[in-house]
């Protein structure tokens, strides 16, 4: 049965962050694992993909990843299927929105002493907690003339008076993070002596060494004062600038200019307006330094004509969010058509050959521009340059069969011989252009050959028949030196093949005719009873009309085959004594004797003082030691044949005589005593 070792479990996840649903199975045989989301199979994308048996999320998406995931393991052989427990994500997210006027219906209806309700359009999960600000100052709940309803994200001012005038913003925070209103609401209830916001500073993102400008304006009667502060509460004026803000200028209209911005200048700037009466108005804006990271590399892609394909460009991390666009041949792609950009994706619909080339994904923001190329190849079905032709190839020579095709990408060519794939080896070689080389053509190479040229777009094939032009040759060539045993029957075969069946005849090399007891029967030389006179040089001649004749010379030797007169015997010797292994052979030519001891030939010239081989072939070993034990082989050989015989040699310790044994007691085995 299929058993889940690790099951996916429901878990918290953060919007845009990584996540992993684990799944591990154990089964008697191999299984394949796939995932379901709300009962439908999950397709791999660059954002969400199978990683082994688990499901990996590069960036959780609250819309696409909401639902129930299940891991399914299937043994395709038996059909058994097991399903994991269901798992889902509790996706935490937060999304900014504007501050809007909920009551009254329009700004024109706002009058002193009316009730004003503002709504904060920041949403998220879990439900965030809201904080309201007027002119950048937090409003605490329960103050006398306003109420905050967190459930409905509302701020109610009752009754609204001039002291409520100002720029209203909201922020919300949850377990996921925090966000502030993307657009704020300016409430203006006239009290001429109160400072009122005319122009509020906005958050600014600038590139390093560029300039940043914050605008800030208040109005009141008499005119209000305006002061700028940086994070550490240091006032910024044209007369007294903090050391790290030497390049700051405050203009008469209240605007603050920072030139050649450096990282240390990033932070929160506060603009404070104070009227003759009423509270000071504090407005905040943040200066961010622009940044952009590098882009990941693309793998080259191969597509087939007629299909639809997409290439996703993941934008690099950056501030502000980099804009992404695709270009081809230096031209920006449109947002519709056959080849177009959709979101961050390059879309090629109904792909044509002309779509091949380099496409570039660009990403840019204030910090700079990044680009990454992707090479797209459009595969085409191969076309013929040269098909294989029916061919006549000469035996023994190299033979070539062409299979020249063209396509994109370069086609792969495989060859079949008799419908079986040819794997490259010492005889067959397929060149880069598809040509097949048969290194040394043999008779059985005469058959059908088929080449197939393929790309991902398709394949073409053609076949050709090879006819082998057989050369006139001996099959097999006769051995140039052969021995016949004296006084015995002997045969010397000679056969040949060619394009036409050759005729074969034997003759003596000196031109003399064959004696009557020697017959030439269809190429086989037959000796009824070998005599000494039969020795000599013979020639086998094979001939046919188209190819002429070939000759093979054979020297026949008449020999008396080897027999052993004396063979070595199983021998046991006391350590330190001398061992004698006798061996004598006879034959004609007279055989030579060699010894092999413990699997190596004993070279008479390198035997050392302890070993000696006598003229008659016997081997003597003096002062034997235990390591001399083993099998010894006597090899007798002459130019006609070779024979061997072997015997073991045992070296034993000399026994210490016991009192019970008389001096004449024989040893328990055959012994050489010296």
């Amino acid at each position: 049965a299929i058993v889940f070792i690790k099951q996916p479990s429901s878990q918290d996840a953060l919007q845009g962050r990584r996540a992993l649903l684990r799944c591990e199975v154990e089964a008697p045989g191999p299984v394949h694992v796939y995932w379901l989301l709300d009962g439908a199979p999950v397709q791999d994308t660059e954002r969400r993909f199978a990683q082994g048996s688990s499901l990996s999320f590069a960036a959780v998406d609250r819309l696409q990843d909401s639902g129930t995931f299940q891991c399914v393991a299937r043994d395709d052989v038996t059909g058994e299927e097991a399903r994991s427990a269901n798992a889902s994500f509790n996706i935490k997210w937060i999304e900014a929105g504007p501050v809007v006027l909920k009551h009254p219906a329009s700004e024109a209806e706002i009058q002193p002493q009316t009730q004003v309700t503002l709504r904060c359009h920041i949403d998220g999960h879990p439900r965030p907690t809201y904080q309201w600000f007027r002119d950048g100052t937090p409003l605490s709940d329960g103050q006398s003339n306003h109420t905050v309803s967190s459930k409905e994200r509302n701020l109610t001012l009752r009754p609204a008076g001039p002291e409520h005038s100002g720029l209203y913003s909201c922020c919300a925070h949850s377990a996921f993070g925090q966000a502030c209103s993307s657009q704020n609401f300016t409430l203006s209830i006239a009290d001429e002596s109160f400072a009122r916001v005319v122009l509020a500073p906005q958050d600014v993102v600038v590139a390093r060494y560029e300039e940043a400008m914050f605008h800030c304006q208040f109005s009141a009667q008499p005119p209000p004062s305006l002061q700028w502060l940086f994070e550490d509460e240091t006032p910024i004026t044209n007369r007294s600038r903090p050391p790290h803000l030497r390049r700051a200028t405050v203009f008469a209209n209240g605007s603050l200019l920072l030139t050649q911005v450096r990282p240390r200048n990033a932070g929160i700037y506060r603009c404070i307006g104070q009227g003759q009466r009423g509270p000071p108005i504090i407005l905040e804006a943040t200066l961010h330094l622009a940044e952009i990271e590098d882009m990941p590399l693309f793998e080259p892609r191969v597509f087939t004509a007629g299909s639809e394909e997409r290439v996703t460009c993941l934008p690099p991390k950056g501030l502000p969010e980099p804009s992404v666009w695709w270009e081809h041949a230096g031209v920006r792609l449109p947002t519709h058509g056959r080849v177009y950009q959709k979101g961050h994706e390059l879309v090629l619909a109904n792909i044509a050959e002309s779509d091949a080339g380099v496409y570039t994904c660009h990403a840019a923001n204030l910090a700079g521009q990044r680009r990454q190329d992707v090479n797209i190849t459009v595969a085409t079905v191969p076309s013929w340059l040269k098909k294989p032709q029916d061919s006549q190839l000469e035996e023994g020579k190299p033979g070539y069969l062409d299979c020249l095709t063209q396509a994109t990408p370069k086609p792969t060519v495989v060859w079949y011989r008799n419908q079986m794939l040819i794997s490259e080896d010492s005889r067959f070689e397929v060149f880069k252009n598809g040509t097949l080389r048969i290194n040394s053509v043999e008779v059985y190479d005469g058959t059908w050959y088929r080449c197939m040229s393929s790309t991902p777009a398709g394949s073409i094939e053609a076949q050709a028949r090879v006819q082998v032009l057989e050369k006139l040759k001996f099959t097999p060539p006769p051995q140039p030196q052969q021995c016949m045993e004296f006084d015995k029957e002997a045969t010397v075969p000679c056969s040949a093949t060619g394009r036409e069946k050759p005729t074969i005849k034997w003759e003596r090399a000196d031109g003399s005719s064959l004696p009557e007891w020697v017959t030439d029967n269809a190429g086989t030389l037959h000796f009824a009873r070998v005599t000494r006179d039969d020795a000599g040089n013979y020639t086998c001649i094979a001939s046919n009309g188209p190819q002429g004749q070939i000759r093979a010379h054979v020297q026949l030797t008449v020999a008396v085959f080897i027999t052993f007169k004396v063979e070595p015997e199983r021998t046991t010797v006391y350590q330190g004594h001398t061992a004698l292994l006798q061996c004598e052979a006879q034959g004609d030519p007279k055989p030579l004797i060699q010894w092999k001891g413990k699997d190596r030939i004993l070279d008479p010239t390198k035997l050392g003082p302890r070993m000696h081989i006598f003229q008659n072939g016997s081997l003597v070993i003096h002062d034997v030691a235990p390591e001399d034990s083993g099998r010894y082989t006597c090899i007798a050989g002459n130019s006609c044949n070779i024979k061997h015989t072997e015997a073991p040699l045992y070296v034993v310790d000399k026994p210490v005589p016991e009192e019970s044994e008389g001096p004449g007691s024989p040893p328990p085995y055959k012994m050489i005593q010296t």
Epitope: P30, H32, Y34, G39, P41, Q43, D44, V72, R74, D75, D76, V77, T78, G79, E80, E81, A82, R83
Partner: antibody, heavy 112, light 110 residues
Amino acid sequence: EVQLVESGGGLVQPGGSLRLSCTASGFSLSNYVMNWVRQAPGKGLEWVGIIDSSGSTYYASWAKGRFTISRDTSKNTVYLQMNSLRAEDTAVYFCARGLYLWGQGTLVTVSS
Amino acid sequence: EIVMTQSPSTLSASVGDRVIITCQSSQSVYNNNLLAWYQQKPGKAPKLLIYYTSNLHSGVPSRFSGSGSGAEFTLTISSLQPDDFATYYCQGGYNGNIYAFGQGTKLTVL
């Protein structure tokens, strides 16, 4: 003994409908996936569709709309409902559990 | 639509021959290895030989072997026996619980 037996084949007119049954014995359908495969006379095998252990079904593109796979776990039987039949649907229809356990097949002939 | 192409469609060989059948898919199979090979004799249901590209099913002789990955696969019979003359099919499994067969390769006596 684990085995599959198809039934319900026969002669049907073009445009007609037919329901094939595949009765399983020796195992419970609710733990296994079941395939329907067909083979026209003298032709190759053609995958029709699959019903998985939860009862979800998936079909070859040509079978969508006309063919429906279902099951009755109490009867341990899988069904193939075929509508708007054509002459080219004439074939032996096999049911199979996984890759190796196949039924003997049932012949469906569509002819007027 | 997924297309699986077997080659050759027919193949003549002799007992003792080494035989190779190839199977090409128009898209990669699931996990790059969800491919099976069957043998079918006339009037019989198909018989599983190899599953997951290269695993030999129990009872199948070791002269049968499979290899490949992604969209290209081969079935090899190392030394053809008299019982091996039949029709052979490849079957691929794909993302989304979709399966498809090749058109078959008929192996006959030369």
